[in-house]
Each structure stands twice: as C-alpha cells, then as structure tokens.
C-alpha cells in the first residue's frame, strides 16, 4: 500500500531512509538533455522473496534528440498522488542494509541520472531525521517517522526533532543526546513497525553518527 503523503517536513532538518521497504518505487528520472530510453522502465521497484530483496527494472537514460533546457519529468503511475524528491550525492551506505529482511538498499546511481530522486514509499517505511549543517538539535526525541495505516488511511508519525541555529545552553552539561527510542512508548505514541534487532542498531546509529550518513539530501 503506497503512502498517500510525503514524510513530514521539519524546519532545518533533512530525512533519509536507511533502507526501502518492498513495494517502494523509484522514478527513472534523467538529467537535462537526456531522457529514458524508449523501451525503458518508468520506475524501479523494490521486490523480493523471504531471503533477498532487490530493485527490479533498470533505469536507463539516453541523449535527447531535442536538447531543450526544460527539466525532464517522468510520468507518474496513475495511482500515485505524491512524490518525494531527494538530491543525489555519493551513494555511500551508512549501515549494512542487506541484513534487514524485506528491504532494499539505496540503488546505485545510473548514467545521466537526474540530480533528484523521486521515491514512492509504502506503509511501514521508516525515515530518519537530522538537523542540517549549521543547526543543532535543541531537542531530539524519536527522530524518525513511520508511514502507518490507520482507519484505512495512511499517515506519517511526527518526528520529535527541533533544530536551532542558536548556541547550546544545556541545563545539564555533558548529558548525551537521546537515541530514537521506539520501545517504552505507549501504543498511541509508538511507531509500531519494523522492530528487528538490525533495524534498532541502525536507528541508534542514525541518531548518533555524523552528518556523513545522510548522503542523500531530501528537498
């Protein structure tokens, strides 16, 4: 089931999926002056069996016959209402994502790929937030959002991250920033999805690792 909306926007923060749930689609977008090959796929799809997940279809771009300067926009499958754009940088993997069943890792870039990636997320997808450069977390509660199905509608949980450009004024010096901690929250507050040990390790790493883990910047 596709998520109706994009993950929540948080002021001065970006989000990143550490892995993509099966069913996630990534549009095949090409940079200016290039287009999808005629027989090429509209999108890549994360699919898999019980032991292995991977991206079906390959995106391929070819030089446009008419090199106009307008941005190429890939047609959307009809049922998709929303799209999320991500700016491509180096495809470094922060954590071994292959260890998470039912999820695909970040697809490698393809030749002449557009600078933005447009994903269509599915129910159960989790994304992680951090403050952009020049800002810090004034408060970091659970800094993730999960796409959930409630009463037949999809919604994303609200991440509890507040970023500020001000200098630190902590009342308790030396106290570490908290980890995102799904366990221990009442049901109404819980991101009640994906709770494998591997993913919790990723969650903890996402909360503590340096900016470099967010190699794909979300617009």
């Amino acid at each position: 089931e596709l998520c109706d909306d994009d993950p929540p926007e948080i002021p001065h923060a970006t989000f990143k999926a550490m892995a993509y749930k099966e069913g996630t689609m990534l549009n095949c977008e090409c940079k200016r002056g290039f287009r999808r090959i005629k027989s090429g796929s509209l999108y890549m799809l994360c699919t898999g069996n019980s032991s292995h997940s991977s991206w079906d279809n390959q995106c391929q771009c070819t030089s446009s016959a008419t090199r106009n300067t307008t941005k190429q926009v890939t047609p959307q499958p009809e049922e998709q209402k929303e799209r999320k754009t991500t700016e491509m940088q180096s495809p470094m993997q922060p954590v071994d994502q292959a260890s998470l069943p039912g999820h695909c890792r970040e697809p490698p870039p393809w030749e002449n790929e557009a600078t933005e990636r447009i994903y269509h997320f599915v129910v159960g997808q989790m994304v992680y937030y951090q403050c952009v450069q020049g800002y810090r977390a004034l408060h970091r509660g659970p800094a993730e959002s999960v796409c959930k199905m409630t009463h037949g509608k999809t919604r994303w949980t609200q991440p509890q991250l507040i970023c500020t450009g001000e200098m630190e004024t902590s009342q308790f010096p030396g106290e570490e920033k908290p980890q995102a901690s799904p366990e221990g929250r009442p049901e109404s507050e819980t991101s009640c999805l994906v709770t494998t040990t591997d993913f919790q390790i990723q969650t903890e790493m996402a909360a503590t690792m340096e900016t470099s883990i967010f190699t794909t910047e979300y617009q």
Epitope: E9, L138, H139, R140, G141, P142, G165, S170, S181
Partner: antibody
C-alpha cells in the same frame, strides 16, 4: 491518554516571583520538548520559549528573556516556568504544550498580579 | 522578527456555511504554519500543521492551504462546536509566532 496537568491559579503581589508547573503523563516524557505560551487580552497568544525535556536545553522568545526561566525535572516528568519581577502586565493565562507541533496543551494556569 | 497578520479578527457566520481565515507573514515561511482552535476554559487544540496536514481525529470539514507568505484556513459546513477563537502559528524558525486570532461567532 496524553495529559499535561498544570498547577492552580496564582494571585501575587507586584515585584515578587512565581513558579508554575506542568506535569506530563500518558507518554514518554523525555521524548517531547515542552513549550510555554502566554495568553493575555493585549497580545492574544505569545510563544515564550521551549525546553528540551531530555537535557534541559532552552530557547526563549527575546521578549521574555530575563522575565521567564524554564526548567525541567525528568524524575517527576514535570516542567516549570518561573516568572520574575512581576507586574500587572504579567497577568495572563500561561499554557504548556508539547512536541514539535504543539499537539497537546495543558489546561492553563491563571496568574493575577495585583497589589 | 517575522510578523504574522491574521484576518479577520472576528467573523460571524451561519451554521452549515463556510468560513475562511487568512494569515500573512512578512517572509516566506516554507509552509511551516499550524492552526489551532481555542475555546474558553480549555487549552488550544491543534487542527492543522504544515499548512494542510489534518491532525488525526479532526473532521475533514477543516482544511488549510497556502505557500510562501500567504496561508488560509477553511471550515466547511459550520457546526455549533466550531464556535471558538482560531490562531495560526508559524514555526519555521525560533522564536515561533502566533497570529492575532480570529473569533468565530454564529449569526
């Protein structure tokens, strides 16, 4: 269910200080930051500031720097706001609210400053 | 500081009708605006955040739209329980700022 329970009404003399409280329950207290908001006839709602319930980090509206001091006690899941050197202009209802989008609010604490 | 101008300051409407409130900001706030309903003797209630995202449990009669510096909030098919004061809040950067409020009354 999520609740923010605030302390009762206060009637105080000008020049003194007062400390009001906001106790969170029904959720993991340290997951959510807490905000304080002033409601007065003159200025409707005014955002006073925010405190991290996790580490006590704060950010104030410049208008309330030196007037309000926010603190938090994790052990009792309670946030406090002290208002100093009170004048009649501080008479108002003060609310606490939680989180990155103020999704739950306390019932308000009425402060009356009168000689 | 970013200024928030909410209008109108008061509004009289008929039950079953539609009302629209607006908030204008002095700078682009990138859709980081929320709307709250406030009734006497209670704490305010979050209705919409990030311009148009309805808070769970809020009826779909409520809606929000806008971008840049101009935002609006609408209530369709006005019901008696909608009578309240409504506030916008910009939260794109600290310190956050509320609009002046709109008192909604029934004609």
């Amino acid at each position: 269910q999520v609740q923010l329970q605030q302390s009762g009404p206060e009637v105080v003399r000008p020049g003194v200080s007062v400390k009001i409280s906001c106790k969170g329950s029904g959720y993991t207290f340290t997951d959510y930051a807490l905000h304080w908001v002033k409601q007065s006839h003159a200025k409707s709602l005014e955002w006073i500031g925010i405190i991290s319930s996790y580490n006590g980090d704060t950010s104030y509206n410049p208008r309330f720097k030196g007037k309000a001091t926010m603190t938090v006690d994790k052990s009792s899941s309670t946030a406090y706001m002290e208002l100093a050197r009170l004048t009649s202009e501080d008479s108002a209802i003060y609310y606490c609210a939680r989180g990155s989008n103020l999704d739950y609010w306390g019932q308000g604490t009425t402060l009356t400053v009168s000689s | 500081d970013i200024q928030m101008t909410q209008s109108p300051s008061s509004l009289s409407a008929s039950l079953g009708g539609k009302v629209t409130l607006t908030c204008k900001t002095s700078q682009d706030i990138n859709k980081f605006i929320a709307w709250y309903q406030h009734k006497p003797g209670e704490g305010p209630r979050l209705i919409i955040h990030y311009t148009s995202t309805l808070q769970p449990g809020i009826p779909s009669r409520f809606s929000g739209s806008g971008s840049g510096k101009d935002y609006s909030f609408s209530i369709n098919n006005l019901e008696p329980e909608d009578i309240a004061t409504y506030y916008c809040l910009r939260y794109d950067d600290l310190p956050w700022t509320f609009g002046g409020g709109t008192k909604l009354e029934v004609r």
